[in-house]
């Protein structure tokens, strides 16, 4: 299709543009260019006849146009009025017309912009500043840059006047930056010189450094004061309210106990007229003090609280050391030391974090140790454990149950039988029990500090006869050559012997069979399909014996390699082909057939009536077991011969 491409599309005044023609047909009579979106003889720029190679100017010809033999039109010394559409009209050799329209836009070259400001020294949190990008230019886009980055999103920044004005409301010190504006149109982009915004601010509350407040007698005291301020602040020092000097630093050599007191730094900003002060209390010790540990939390809760241990006092030029359980600190992501090593933070304390903890201050000759501190970590109660673990008792014996749950403070215990409260003790003792003492025995552990409670329930059966046991299994459908199965004989009973039978026989000797847990558990490793048998467990004591119902192990296996029957591979034309596929598998597999690789049907039997030599090929049976996730297949070649061509061929079904 005939198309016009304007190169460039956006043209600067005074430059030139080429209306480039694409897909110009062959065998032309000629072509004409028109100003506008249609063929209009009154707006013809120029015409060109191929045969005579003659160009004829039209009414819209300005003398700045050059037409090329490939029909492209060059317009030179572009003026604003040249903006718009141009139509090329092509007449082919057979006098068939074709036309295409292109367009371009004309823009002026932009001058270098500059920034004007309504406030050269705005005061922080008080003044607004409006920057305006000069000059105002038609059809130009205005952009702003702060430190050579595009404008950040902020409710204090507002663009107006077609983005030509940038207003900063309630200026802050962070607005002190290099500001540039840029003017753009499609043919040029110019950026202004940068304007630095000078925001007056402060002084902020001064900071006195170093931060430590404890000194030893004989040291030099060197305090420095700093307050963020523009212009820079003027500083004054006061000791116990008395003016000392107008300097940023205060130096007192060889201090004594008498130099203890309150030290005040005052910062003043002459432009904003503001004053701010900060006071620090300095203590001068005659001797290095014995350190001690303070804690921000004396009773932290396990897995909830963090604890910050701080070594006091704070002394200048001192090294702080820590020990836990009389060892140096272990490496742990839950242990964090502050930059000066004075504070040790334990994140998310556990019951194992009790300590003891010690800190030390190292001086020239020795290390002074604090007294040890032990953390009282509140935890628990954990799930209580009832011992012993027996659930069956004979009448006449004594029942003695003990309950324990890890807890700090120690748990308070309660016993319930069949939901009825019995006593608030850790141990429950009932002498000479009878069948009536059978029931649900609940131990409840309570932590008074955390308010948390946990319970454990145990079923106690008192009976002269042992109950009929049952078998529990950890895997009801194990996969052959992959899974293990553990059978457990329930219940657990006191003074009881556990026995096992497989298919009515005592256990065979096998490295894959293992008894454990007082013969109460039978484990079969790497099960096979031959393990799919009836398993029975038995319990017996001096007065009775009982056997469980059999449990048959359902082993999932296969599919094995399938067999296609009948085995014949040669058939006579006209016979019926009746192939049956079978594969050992549990559960039964899904069957499918493919003939020469083409899927056929999902049946176990493949039947084709009256076969011909066209039925020659490979017959594949595919089997899949969805339970084991395994697949298998077999391929059989079938040859069909025309009737009577070869002896010994199967007549088929």
């Amino acid at each position: 299709k005939l198309t016009i491409e304007s190169t460039p599309f956006n043209v600067a005044e005074g430059k030139e543009v080429l209306l480039l023609v694409h897909n110009l047909p062959q065998h032309l009579f000629g072509y004409s260019w028109y100003k506008g979106e249609r063929v209009d003889g009154n707006r013809q720029i120029i015409g060109y006849v191929i045969g005579t190679q003659q160009a004829t100017p039209g009414p819209a010809y300005s003398g700045r146009e050059i037409i090329y033999p490939n029909a492209s039109l060059l317009i030179q010394n572009i003026i604003q009025n040249d903006t718009g559409f141009y139509t090329l009209h092509v007449i082919k050799s057979d006098l068939v017309n074709e036309e295409a329209t292109g367009q371009f836009r004309v823009y002026p070259e932009l001058p270098k912009p500059s920034i004007s400001s309504n406030n050269s020294k705005p005061v922080e949190d008080k003044d607004a500043v409006a920057f305006t990008c000069e000059p105002e230019t038609q059809d130009a886009t205005y952009l702003w840059w702060v430190n050579n980055q595009s404008l950040p999103v902020s409710p204090r920044l507002q663009l107006s006047n077609g983005n030509r004005t940038l207003t900063l409301f309630n200026v802050t010190r962070n607005d002190t930056a290099s500001y540039k504006c840029e003017t753009q149109n499609p043919v040029s982009a110019r950026r202004s010189d940068s304007v630095i915004l000078n925001v007056l601010y402060g002084p902020d509350a001064p900071t006195i450094s170093p931060l430590n407040t404890s000194y030893r007698s004989g040291e030099n005291l060197n305090l420095s004061c700093h307050a963020a301020s523009n212009p820079p602040a003027q500083y004054s020092w006061f000791v116990n309210g008395t003016f000392q000097q107008s300097t940023q630093e205060l130096f007192i050599p060889n201090i004594t106990v008498n130099n203890s007191g309150s030290y005040t730094c005052q910062a003043h900003n002459s432009d904003t007229g503001l004053n701010r002060t900060t006071v620090t209390t300095i203590t001068v010790y005659a001797e290095p003090p014995k350190p001690f540990i303070t804690s921000n939390n004396s009773n932290p809760v396990e897995d909830e609280d963090a604890v910050a241990l701080t070594c006091e006092p704070e002394i200048q030029n001192t090294t702080y050391l820590w020990w836990v359980n009389n060892q140096s600190l272990p490496v742990s992501p839950r242990l964090q030391l502050s930059n000066d090593n004075r504070t040790l933070t334990l994140l998310s304390v556990t019951r194992n974090d009790v300590g003891p903890y010690e800190c030390g201050i190292q001086n020239e000759l020795s290390v002074d140790h604090s007294d040890p501190v032990i953390l009282n970590v509140l935890y628990g109660p954990d799930d209580p454990t009832i011992s012993p673990s027996y659930t069956y008792y004979r009448p006449g014996v004594n029942l003695s149950l003990s309950c324990h749950a890890a807890s700090n403070p120690p748990a308070q215990y309660s016993w319930l039988i069949d939901g009825n409260i019995q006593q608030h003790t850790q141990e429950l003792f009932i002498s000479n029990i009878t069948e009536k003492n059978s029931g649900l025995y609940t131990c409840q552990a309570n932590n008074s500090a955390s308010g948390h409670s946990r319970t454990t329930v145990k079923t106690i059966t008192v009976s002269a006869e042992l109950p009929k046991p049952s078998i529990s299994s950890n895997n009801s459908k194990p996969v052959e050559d992959k899974d293990a199965v553990a059978f457990t004989c329930e219940p657990e009973a006191q003074n009881t012997t556990y026995l096992w039978w497989v298919n009515g026989q005592s256990l065979p000797v096998s490295p894959r069979l293992q008894l454990s847990n007082g013969n109460r558990t039978l484990t079969l490793f790497n099960v096979t399909r031959n393990d799919a048998r009836a398993y029975v467990c038995g319990i017996q004591n001096s007065v009775s014996a009982n056997r469980s119902d059999p449990v048959t192990l359902d082993v999932l296996y296969g599919p094995d390699t399938p067999i296609i029957s009948p085995p014949d591979s040669s058939y006579l034309s006209g016979a019926n082909l009746n192939l049956s596929c079978h594969s050992a598998s549990n559960p039964s597999p899904q069957y499918s057939w493919r003939i020469n690789g083409i899927p056929q049907q999902h049946t176990q039997v493949l039947f084709i009536a009256k076969i011909t030599p066209n039925n020659n090929g490979t017959y594949a049976c595919f089997v899949s077991n969805l339970a084991t996730g395994r697949n298998n297949s077999i391929v059989k070649s079938i040859t069909v011969s025309a009737s009577g061509t070869s002896p010994g061929l199967s007549a088929g079904a």
Epitope: H27, F29, G30, V39, D40, D94, L95
Partner: antibody, heavy 121, light 106 residues
Framework: EVQLLESGGGLVQPGGSLRLSCAAS????????MGWVRQAPGKGLEWVSS????????SYADSVKGRFTISRDNSKNTLYLQMNSLRAEDTAVYYC??????????????WGQGTLVTVSS | DIQMTQSPSSLSASVGDRVTITCRAS??????LNWYQQKPGKAPKLLIY???SLQSGVPSRFSGSGSGTDFTLTISSLQPEDFATYYC????????FGQGTKLEIK
């Protein structure tokens, strides 16, 4: 001055043939496209055929395609229309016309006075 | 092929009248439309080309307009020599003419 003069018209029986000529003067014939337009008695104008300056490009109306042939001899400044298998409905005044050598959408700026062709038994 | 339909097929008017003849194409032909004037016994004469461009030597009372499918020839003030038959012609392929509009003296 541009002049176009047609000749060769006359009475012819259905199925017969006729050759029309158009002698051109007053312009550069060899670089001009030329065409034939006809007008049946009391009817409107019907474009018949056109030919490019070098005889390479020819076009015909469906009604005459396969029966009429347009040709030119640039050395003689003459345009021809060979009409075969003539029918009664071909009866008309046949005009020779020029396409100008400024590429406007195709138009016929100069016409001859026409020659009458009558097809009748 | 593209069909050209002129209306009206005939028209009576007086000297000094403003006359409008319309031509409709069966499909869009852009601006590829020419108007011709033919007087009895004479060859046609080109008036307007490219829908609206006046052929050199044609009086300015003749004007053309339209694009796509609908076109108009207007004679702003009829003169005695303007009574003739007017044809529109589409300059596509093939170059078919309208059936003509006969302009007569009232």
């Amino acid at each position: 001055e541009v002049q176009l003069l047609e000749s060769g018209g006359g009475l012819v029986q259905p199925g017969g043939s006729l050759r029309l000529s158009c002698a051109a003067s007053g312009f550069t014939f060899s670089s001009s496209y030329m065409g034939w337009v006809r007008q049946a008695p009391g009817k409107g104008l019907e474009w018949v055929s056109s030919i490019g300056s070098g005889s390479y490009s020819t076009s015909y109306a469906d009604s005459v395609k396969g029966r009429f042939t347009i040709s030119r001899d640039n050395s003689k400044n003459t345009l021809y229309l060979q009409m075969n298998s003539l029918r009664a409905e071909d009866t008309a005044v046949y005009y020779c016309a020029r396409y100008p050598s400024v590429p406007f959408p195709p138009l016929l700026d100069y016409w001859g006075q026409g020659t009458l062709v009558t097809v009748s038994s | 092929d593209i069909q050209m339909t002129q209306s009206p097929s005939s028209l009576s008017a007086s000297v000094g009248d403003r006359v409008t003849i319309t031509c409709r194409a069966s499909q869009s032909i852009s601006s590829y439309l020419n108007w011709y004037q033919q007087k009895p016994g004479k060859a046609p004469k080109l008036l307007i080309y490219a829908a609206s461009s006046l052929q050199s030597g044609v009086p300015s009372r003749f004007s053309g307009s339209g694009s796509g499918t609908d076109f108009t020839l207007t004679i702003s003030s009829l003169q005695p020599e303007d009574f003739a038959t007017y044809y529109c012609q589409q300059a596509g392929n093939p170059h078919t003419f309208g059936q003509g509009t006969k302009l007569e003296i009232k």
